[in-house]
């Protein structure tokens, strides 16, 4: 359509523009974790705020039960961070006694659940051996990427240890996606 | 407007459609600190090269004083990395003197500052234990999310530590943000 | 164009509206890298998927011989993490042997090649020094921002060991980017 | 709902050693670190240590570090503490506590009573 | 080992008031402080975490507010059900430590 004159003598049959204020968009931050029951063989799932503070969810991206419900099939850059705080991991002890010294770790995964698909499909994975010298240790891992979603796909974040989530700020663990 | 006619026989209202080489954009690159005076109680703020090499500003998202300006509102991704390097971390040492174990840390914050409210918002916030081993560390942080701004918004981005920042490349420590 | 209305009786230039299904696109992700010939004095290439599981190449953005390929001059945003992993690196050995503690490290570069220059650009960097306690240690490396490209401008990611690339899942290692 | 469910009063003497089990039910008792509390007659609250259930990983405080252990049977969901060589401080109310984090303790079992005295 | 202090130790007050209870670190903990509420015979109720957010089912005269060292609890307007001990209580840092509480009883 570039630069492209359309004479007024005839209908025109548009492309598919839209208005980028239009496109489902969300931000969603970090609530404290309460202790759930899980799937098992699966990595616990976030659940997050939507609304409050710097959250939102907008054109018909909703968020429900820890998912992000795709309202719109096409290409979205997804992103979240997840702050991890903890003690001094076992690394240590374990090296001490003698053991094999299988560091402890920490996980990040976006998820993506298709209703049609048995199995979830792990769009991202960001994971992180954890051996800290200090007694109290703390760090993000961030992911972001693009995927081409479907109508009714639903997005999740899971990680390998709930219980070691920073929950105290909103800017320190988020979830978010938006239609390109 | 998806693939809807319309007949040039009587006037149209468009949706607020826009060329996307129109949407305020910036890319700033890392460039020497020089010490200044910093707000009591705050990081201390990054300043930025705005048009050299890779950095740019275009379409009024201007870069003044440490501060990008969002000429427009609507919903902004923004993002930064900032590459920290130092020695030890006096963490080990404290260890050994005894004292509390109070790791040292790294952190970058995103801040937003609203001429209408008091205080300045965190966006997003990066941080990192440090207890490193080796003498000589280095570390990259990195940051991004999208968020609803409103025209006038001004955006930085603060350090816990400015002597720790890596200038030496512009492709080591960055910031920027572009409306969707 | 925000709310205008257009009377019929005259032809209209529009601005260089696009539907946004249409943009450059490619989402790569990590595949086993074989032994290949590098460039001296320059990190190895890696190589990547462009077509299976999550990976994609859409709207003229083309995959070949490492290198992604822009069809088209404009505002890009470009991302890729690369996971490491390894074995206790030999920083803990090096001083204990007194020798100077230069500590190893793990870098990732986004490098852009155009042909009428004679030096590729390197547009992101993420480097980290690795001094893990630990025997076996893993770790990401994330990257994202925006850049201005030129049609015919090809991108390629490097790293400092290839082999030390974590290969084994799609989701740990990928590469992309994709026109705003 | 999530519930710990404690075990029975105990009276023991000088020197002896007591175990204090904690069933959990209603979550996933892998994901959340139990922690277990101690409250002295007319005193306040203190921490003991914490288990992670899924590692079997403990943190004590200085104070018990050679009296207590702290172990788990996923099998059950239950976590065990047993404090060895007890005096006459060591009566109280011993509670163990499940966190949504590591740091806080979102829900409390009924507490035991644990008496020492010859 | 990181210090709590509490203050008042105790307080009388009636149903209606406004009651601040403050609490002290002997050093910086961020924003990882937590109050619980405990009742005679009654194992401790969670109220407030990091520093400053209820935590779920908690009524919203109850808030939390600080950082750092520096932290208070205050419950705006006093009910029959809130008269209790409350403890604060640290997450910064091994060992987790509590305040030896604020007893709040009926004037």
């Known amino acids: 359509l570039k630069g492209q004159e359309f004479a007024p003598s005839h209908q025109q049959v548009y492309a598919p523009l839209r208005a980028d204020g239009d496109k489902p968009r969300a931000h969603l931050t970090v609530v404290r974790q309460t202790p759930t029951q899980h799937f098992k063989n699966q990595f616990p799932a976030l659940h997050w705020e939507h609304e409050l503070g710097l959250a939102f969810t907008k054109n018909r991206m909703n968020y429900t039960n820890k998912f992000l419900l795709i309202p719109e099939s096409g290409d979205y850059f997804i992103y979240s961070q997840v702050t991890f705080r903890g003690m001094t991991s076992e690394c240590s002890e374990i090296r001490q006694a003698g053991r094999p010294n299988k560091p402890d770790s920490i996980t990040v995964v976006i998820t993506k659940v298709t209703d049609s698909y048995p199995e979830p499909t792990q769009l991202l994975m960001g994971t992180k051996s954890v051996c800290e010298v200090g007694s109290n240790w703390f760090q993000p891992i961030y992911l972001g990427a693009m995927f081409s979603l479907q109508e009714g796909d639903k997005l999740m974040v899971n990680v390998s240890d709930i219980s070691l989530v920073d929950y105290t700020k909103e800017d320190k663990t988020f979830f978010g996606a938006f239609l390109l | 407007l998806k693939g809807q006619e319309f007949a040039p026989s009587h006037q149209q209202v468009y949706a607020p459609l826009r060329a996307d080489g129109d949407k305020p954009r910036a890319h700033l690159t890392v460039v020497r600190q020089t010490p200044t005076q910093h707000f009591k109680n705050q990081f201390p703020a990054l300043h930025w090269e705005h048009e050299l090499g890779l950095a740019f500003t275009k379409n009024r998202m201007n870069y003044t004083n440490k501060f990008l300006l969002i000429p427009e509102s609507g919903d902004y991704f923004i993002y930064s990395q900032v590459t920290f390097r130092g020695m030890t971390s006096e963490c080990s040492e404290i260890r050994q003197a005894g004292r509390p174990n109070k790791p040292d840390s790294i952190t970058v914050v995103i801040t937003k500052v609203t001429d209408s409210y008091p205080e300045p918002t965190q966006l997003l916030m990066g941080t990192k234990s440090v207890c490193e081993v080796g003498s000589n560390w280095f570390q990259p942080i990195y940051l991004g999310a999208m968020f609803s701004l409103q025209e006038g918004d001004k955006l930085m981005v603060n350090v816990s530590d400015i002597s720790l920042v890596d200038y030496t490349k512009e492709d080591k420590t960055f910031f920027g943000a572009f409306l969707l | 164009l925000k709310g205008q209305e257009f009377a019929p009786s005259h032809q209209q230039v529009y601005a260089p509206l696009r539907a946004d299904g249409d943009k450059p696109r490619a989402h790569l992700t990590v595949v086993r890298q074989t032994p290949t010939q590098h460039f001296k004095n320059q990190f190895p290439a890696l190589h990547w998927e462009h077509e299976l599981g999550l990976a994609f190449t859409k709207n003229r953005m083309n995959y070949t011989n490492k290198f992604l390929l822009i069809p088209e001059s404009g505002d890009y945003f470009i991302y890729s993490q690369v996971t490491f992993r390894g074995m206790t690196s030999e920083c803990s050995e090096i001083r204990q042997a007194g020798r100077p503690n230069k500590p190893d490290s793990i870098t990732v570069v986004i490098t852009k090649v155009t042909d009428s220059y004679p030096e590729p650009t390197q547009l992101l960097m993420g480097t980290k020094s690795v001094c893990e306690v630990g025997s076996n240690w893993f770790q990401p490396i994330y990257l994202g921002a925006m850049f201005s490209l030129q049609e015919g401008d090809k991108l390629m990611v490097n790293v400092s060991d290839i082999s030390l690339v974590d290969y084994t899942k799609e989701d740990k290692t990928f590469f992309g980017a994709f026109l705003l | 709902q999530v519930q710990l469910v404690q075990s029975e009063a105990e009276v023991k003497k000088p020197g002896a050693s007591v175990k204090v089990s904690c069933k959990a039910s209603g979550y996933t008792f892998t994901a959340y670190y139990i922690h277990w509390v101690r409250q002295a007659p007319g005193q306040g609250l203190e921490w003991m240590g914490w288990?992670?259930?899924?590692?079997?990983?403990?943190n004590y405080a200085q104070k018990f570090q050679d009296r207590v252990t702290m172990t788990g049977d996923t099998s059950i969901s239950t976590a065990y503490m047993e404090l060895r060589r007890l005096r006459s401080d060591d009566t109280a109310v011993y509670y163990c506590?499940?966190?949504?984090?590591?740091?806080?303790?979102?829900?409390w079992g009924q507490g035991t009573m644990v008496t020492v005295s010859s | 080992d990181i210090q709590m202090t509490q203050s008042p130790s105790s307080l009388s007050a009636s149903v209606g008031d406004r009651v601040t209870i403050t609490c002290r670190a002997s050093q910086s903990i961020s924003s990882y402080l937590n109050w619980y509420q405990q009742k005679p015979g009654k194992a401790p109720k969670f109220l407030i975490y990091g520093a400053s957010r209820l935590q779920s089912g908690v009524p919203s005269r109850f808030s939390g507010s600080g950082s750092g060292t520096d932290f208070t609890l205050t419950i705006s307007s006093l009910q029959p059900e809130d008269f209790a001990t409350y403890y604060c209580q640290q997450g910064y840092s091994s060992p987790f430590t509590f305040g030896p509480g604020t007893k709040v009883d009926i004037k």
């Open positions: 288990i992670n259930p899924n590692s079997g990983g403990t």
């Open positions: 506590a499940v966190g949504g984090s590591y740091d806080a303790f979102d829900i």
